[in-house]
Structure formats: structure tokens, C-alpha cells
Interface confidence: medium
């Protein structure tokens, strides 16, 4: 499932290239392994901003698919409780390109530990 999440992220990158979306998104660019689930949930929440800002049906579909896949993969990890992690609003705001790059990195972290 995480591999499919990566391919959906790459598709979103492809689709937004031709658009001008100047939204900034809360981004965890240095994820600590003990906070990766919390960070992933922030990424998934912020991803919906791209869907809304783009107004593009194909992006909306891909975001929707990605969220289902990622939540499904997260739930297979069991109910992990993490403490001492940053709230989404405490994270640095970055542009969409940087946000997606950081998102790919955190997904790769999940792939490497699964």
C-alpha cells in the first residue's frame, strides 16, 4: 500500500506542475521515527488543502485514493500512541513542492520499517 501511496504522490506532483497554487502547507521536514504516525496524519490533513486549492477533479480523486490507502496502512500498524510530538499547527509552512518532497520521504520511512 505505501508503494501505491508514493505513486499517487508522484501523480499529484505531475498534475500540479501546470497549475499556480500558492498555498503554504504545514510540513514536517525532519520526521523523528518516534513521531512518524503523528507526522503522517498531519501530512494527510494538509493534503486535502491541495485538493481544495487546485479545484481539479483528477487531483481530488488521487488525493482521496491516497488518503484511503495511507489510513489503511496506518491502521495495520495498530493503535500507536506517540507523545511529545508537534501539533500540525506547530510545523513550518512550506510550498507545495517542498511539502510533497517531505511527504515522499516520510512514506519511504514507513516502507523501510514495514
Amino acid at each position: 500500500n505505501w508503494v501505491n501511496v508514493i505513486s499517487d504522490l508522484k501523480k499529484i506532483e505531475d498534475l500540479i506542475q501546470s497549475m499556480h497554487i500558492d498555498a503554504t502547507l504545514y510540513t514536517e521536514s525532519d520526521v523523528h521515527p518516534s513521531c512518524k504516525v503523528t507526522a503522517m496524519k498531519c501530512f494527510l490533513l494538509e493534503l486535502q488543502v491541495i485538493s481544495l486549492e487546485s479545484g481539479d477533479a483528477s487531483i481530488h480523486d488521487t488525493v482521496e485514493n491516497l488518503i484511503i490507502l495511507a489510513n489503511n496502512s496506518l491502521s495495520s500498524n495498530g493503535n500507536v500512541t506517540e507523545s511529545g510530538c508537534k501539533e500540525c499547527e506547530e510545523l513550518e509552512e512550506k510550498n507545495i513542492k517542498e511539502f510533497l518532497q517531505s511527504f515522499v520521504h516520510i512514506v519511504q520511512m514507513f516502507i523501510n520499517t514495514s
Epitope: 482521496e64 485514493n65 489503511n72 491502521s75
Partner: antibody, heavy 116, light 107 residues
Framework: QVQLVQSGAEVKKPGASVKVSCKAS????????ISWVRQAPGQGLEWMGW????????GYAQKFQGRVTMTRDTSTSTVYMELSSLRSEDTAVYYC?????????WGQGTLVTVSS | DIQMTQSPSSLSASVGDRVTITCQAS??????LNWYQQKPGKAPKLLIY???TLQSGVPSRFSGSGSGTDFTLTISSLQPEDFATYYC?????????FGQGTKVEIK
């Protein structure tokens, strides 16, 4: 893996509505988006739209906008596709399937015949 | 909408033959292309996604290639169970359109 079981064949008159059900079993209901694809007799495949069983969010092909409604009942792990204002060219096998942009598992199909 | 054109629309081949089906998109779809196999009276089955990735459980005699607008599905050595209709589908832009299908028949 998930199994999708669809409701039985329907015969409808032009102008009527049809509601096809798709019940998921085997895997978690919320693990997959559900798409609907139809196939007219002897013809190719046509993508109609999708539903997220978790949120209830939907995305419909422009062609069916205003005529199609996708809903779900989480208590029975069932997704529904309702098509209104039926015409003869809506005669087809309607499939539910998992995924949006890549369709993995398919239901067995439901034949909907529109005839006066 | 993106148009998907498959060729040929049908072909006759023998067991053991190498079979190639092509699919052309009306605009650049990068690698967002899926291939499905459908047997009479049955639901389609996903064979290949992302142009070249084999779906789990699909025999290695099936392969896909291409990117942009031109794509190919190859069956390296046709088996009796491969006689079916094959569809390509673009998953780049909604609505996710299918090709008209290629029927592979026994010669």
C-alpha cells in the same frame, strides 16, 4: 482480500431510477474506494465515478453528473449506485470495483435493462 | 476527455505466439495507464498498472511498456487461458477512459 457481491438483475422502464448495491466482505470495508464502471452489451467499459466509504465523498464523471448518486451504509458494508432518468442506452452491466485510478477487485456485475 | 485508441480491434493467434497490443492516448498521460483482461460473461481483471507494473498474481508472460501517448501490452507466449478481450485505461485525468478493447481469438 476483498469480495464484492452485487444485487441481482433489474428491468426498468425509461424515465425510472435504478439502485444497485455492492456489499463488501473479506477485507475492511473502509480499506478501498469503490468505483462504478458500466458495460453496454457487446461494448467496452465506461467509468462512472467513485465513492470513499469512510467519508462518503464522491467523484462523478461529468457525463453522469446530476443523474448518478453514490451512497453507502457503513453498518452493512454496502455501497449503492443510483441512476435516474433511465433511457434505453443505459442498458448495461454495472460493476462495482475497488480503487479509483487503478481498479483491483471487481464485483460480479448487475445487468440493468431499460425497456418500455 | 482523453480518447484511448487500441489496435488492432481483434487478432487471431496460436498458442505459443508472441502477441502485441497497442494503445494510444489523445494527449500525454505520462505513465498513468492500466491494462485489463476480460473473459466472456466475467468481470475485467487488472493485469498491469502504471504502464509496466505487473499486478500481483499475474503471470510474467504479460508485460507493459510505454509512456506519454503510446503504450504496448505484450504476451510473450500465448496460453489457452489468455484468449480474451484486453482493455487499456488511462488514469491520468477524469473521467478515466478505456480503450475500445482488443479481442484475442484462437487461430
Amino acid at each position: 482480500q476483498v469480495q464484492l457481491v452485487q444485487s441481482g438483475a433489474e428491468v426498468k422502464k425509461p424515465g425510472a431510477s435504478v439502485k444497485v448495491s455492492c456489499k463488501a466482505s473479506g477485507d475492511t470495508f473502509s480499506s478501498y474506494a469503490i468505483s462504478w464502471v458500466r458495460q453496454a452489451p457487446g461494448q467496452g467499459l465506461e467509468w462512472m465515478g467513485w465513492m470513499n466509504p469512510n467519508s462518503g465523498n464522491t467523484g462523478y464523471a461529468q457525463k453522469f453528473q446530476g443523474r448518478v448518486t453514490m451512497t453507502r451504509d457503513t453498518s452493512t458494508s454496502t455501497v449503492y449506485m443510483e441512476l435516474s432518468s433511465l433511457r434505453s442506452e443505459d442498458t448495461a452491466v454495472y460493476y462495482c470495483a475497488t480503487g479509483i485510478t487503478m481498479i483491483g477487485y471487481w464485483g460480479q456485475g448487475t445487468l440493468v435493462t431499460v425497456s418500455s | 476527455d482523453i480518447q484511448m485508441t487500441q489496435s488492432p480491434s481483434s487478432l487471431s493467434a496460436s498458442v505459443g505466439d508472441r502477441v502485441t497490443i497497442t494503445c494510444q492516448a489523445s494527449q500525454d498521460i505520462s505513465s498513468y495507464l492500466n491494462w485489463y483482461q476480460q473473459k466472456p460473461g466475467k468481470a475485467p481483471k487488472l493485469l498491469i498498472y502504471a504502464a509496466s507494473t505487473l499486478q500481483s498474481g499475474v503471470p510474467s508472460r504479460f508485460s507493459g511498456s510505454g509512456s506519454g501517448t503510446d503504450f504496448t501490452l505484450t504476451i510473450s507466449s500465448l496460453q489457452p487461458e489468455d484468449f480474451a478481450t484486453y482493455y487499456c485505461q488511462q488514469s491520468y485525468s477524469t473521467p478515466y477512459t478505456f480503450g475500445q478493447g482488443t479481442k484475442v481469438e484462437i487461430k
